[in-house]
């Protein structure tokens, strides 16, 4: 998130010595918000670190881009930015680490420009279905965003709902198929355990993915087929344990793909040859040369690349007749 | 339904501090914010502090911003108001709301404790 430049000539403040000046008429159109920074030349509105509590109602018409970082909103409700005039050039919004733990339907209607939104570093315990496309209906109008980040918005454990927290996120983004032009989604640190299956499938202009940073123990259920456009996958500090082939076999069929692996807990036992030997002639995996294995005890920190089929092995299962007891 | 029982309330020198305490059961993060609000002798009552449950974002009233400090602990489902620099006409009936906007008006808020009497007199 960027934070205002105070000393930066083109920014001016809200001037309140105006305030008893100007109260009797309605507010100019180009003024700038209490508490907030703007530069018209730059078309730049930052509200940043100010303890607010709603998002200020007369902002300047010109606003192309909004920062209102390290606020206390708690709640953006349905129309949160619906000005009249609208606010028709606001294209980049960035609500990160403002306390929200709500976000309700339709909160970013009448916002026809908008196309990156960052909502990082609030704990979403209420992320409303329609938050994103802004009507129940089961194909709503295309949603401008082409950037959404959604890193760290897991509450913290004690202060979550009971009900799936990826499942909420997942239904955010596929209601109304509002988010078919999305190019950049960004999810990392939210301890997700699971990709539901159908997430991708209908976000195919995807060319950045970020799952970073959670706690994924497979992808066997996720299909990445439809991602042509995908340029890069990260899935960097999960619980991975192997990919399997056909897992494999769709990364290596998309044509622009560069995924990153590291530090998974990758476990090299007979399960795992196929993706040694994927990786050995692949170039889709950026610093593979990194990867290492975690279990069996014996295998840890041996390098992926440097394994032959003869390092995996699984120890047999015993039929139950000779097991002991 | 969420009951609220305040304690913490007396009589303190101006300049002094208190800690309010409201302790929520029932179904405590139903509401997802909590509020004091207060009322002075003949006066209305008027919306002091609010924390949200999740996030714990806060909003004060501009009469006790720097001096007053609202907080809650999940764990324990109580919620607190430390005043510190108090002056006279902090006195008042001190009373914790639950509801679910993130508001400051009355209406804000479906659940009331019964309040704990605060008096700053010298």
């Known amino acids: 998130s960027s934070s205002p430049t105070s000393s930066a000539s083109s920014f001016s403040s809200s001037a309140p010595f105006l305030a008893s000046a100007v109260s009797a008429q309605p507010p100019l159109p180009d003024q700038c918000p209490a508490l907030c920074e703007c530069s018209e030349a730059a078309r730049t509105v930052k509200c940043v670190n100010r303890n607010l509590t709603e998002v200020p109602t007369d902002l300047p018409a010109y606003v192309r881009n909004l920062f209102l970082t390290g606020n206390q909103l708690a709640v953006l409700p349905a129309g949160a930015f619906a000005r009249r005039p609208p606010l028709a050039e606001l294209a980049a919004l960035n609500l990160s680490g403002s306390r929200l733990d709500e976000v309700r339907a339709g909160a970013f209607e009448h916002l026809p420009s908008l196309r990156q939104l960052d909502l990082s570093h609030n704990p979403l315990a209420d992320l409303s279905p329609f938050a994103f496309s802004g009507s129940n209906a089961s194909v709503s109008a295309p949603s401008p965003l082409v950037e959404l980040i959604l890193n760290h918005i897991v509450p913290p454990e004690d202060e979550r709902q009971n009900r799936s927290f990826e499942g909420m996120v997942v239904a955010a983004l596929l209601a109304g198929r509002a988010l078919q032009g999305l190019r950049r989604l960004e999810l990392a640190s939210n301890h997700f355990l699971y990709l539901p299956r159908d997430v991708l499938a209908q976000l195919p202009s995807l060319r950045h993915l970020d799952l970073s940073n959670n706690s994924l123990v497979s992808l066997t259920y996720v299909s990445f087929r439809n991602l042509t456009h995908l340029e890069s996958l990260h899935l960097e500090d999960n619980a991975l344990k192997v990919l399997h082939n056909g897992t494999l076999a769709e990364l290596q069929g998309l044509p622009h793909i560069r995924v990153f692996l590291d530090n998974n807990p990758w476990v090299c036992d007979c399960h795992m040859a196929d993706m040694v030997t994927w990786l050995k002639e692949t170039e889709v995996v950026q610093g593979k040369d990194r990867l290492t294995c975690a279990y069996p005890e014996k295998m840890r920190n041996r390098v992926l690349l440097e394994l032959n089929s003869a390092d995996l092995d699984c120890d047999p299962i015993l039929p139950p007749s000779l097991q002991t007891s | 339904e969420v009951q609220l029982v305040e304690s913490g309330g007396g009589e303190v020198q101006p300049g002094g501090s208190l800690r309010l305490s409201c302790a929520a059961s029932?179904?405590?993060?139903?509401?997802?914010?909590m509020a004091w609000f207060r009322q002075a002798p003949g006066k209305e009552r008027e919306f002091v502090a609010a924390?949200?449950?999740?996030?714990?974002?806060?909003r004060y009233t501009e009469s006790v911003k720097g001096r007053f400090t609202i907080s809650r602990d999940n764990a324990k489902n109580t919620v607190y108001l430390q005043m510190s620099s108090l002056r006279a006409e902090d006195t008042a009936v001190y009373y914790c709301?639950?509801?679910?906007?993130?508001?400051?008006?009355?209406?804000?808020?479906?659940?009331w404790g019964q309040g704990t009497l605060v008096t700053v007199k010298p």
């Open positions: 029932g179904r405590p993060f139903s509401s997802k914010t």
């Open positions: 924390v949200r449950w999740i996030g714990g974002a806060t």
């Open positions: 709301a639950a509801g679910q906007a993130w508001g400051t008006k009355f209406t804000d808020y479906s659940d």
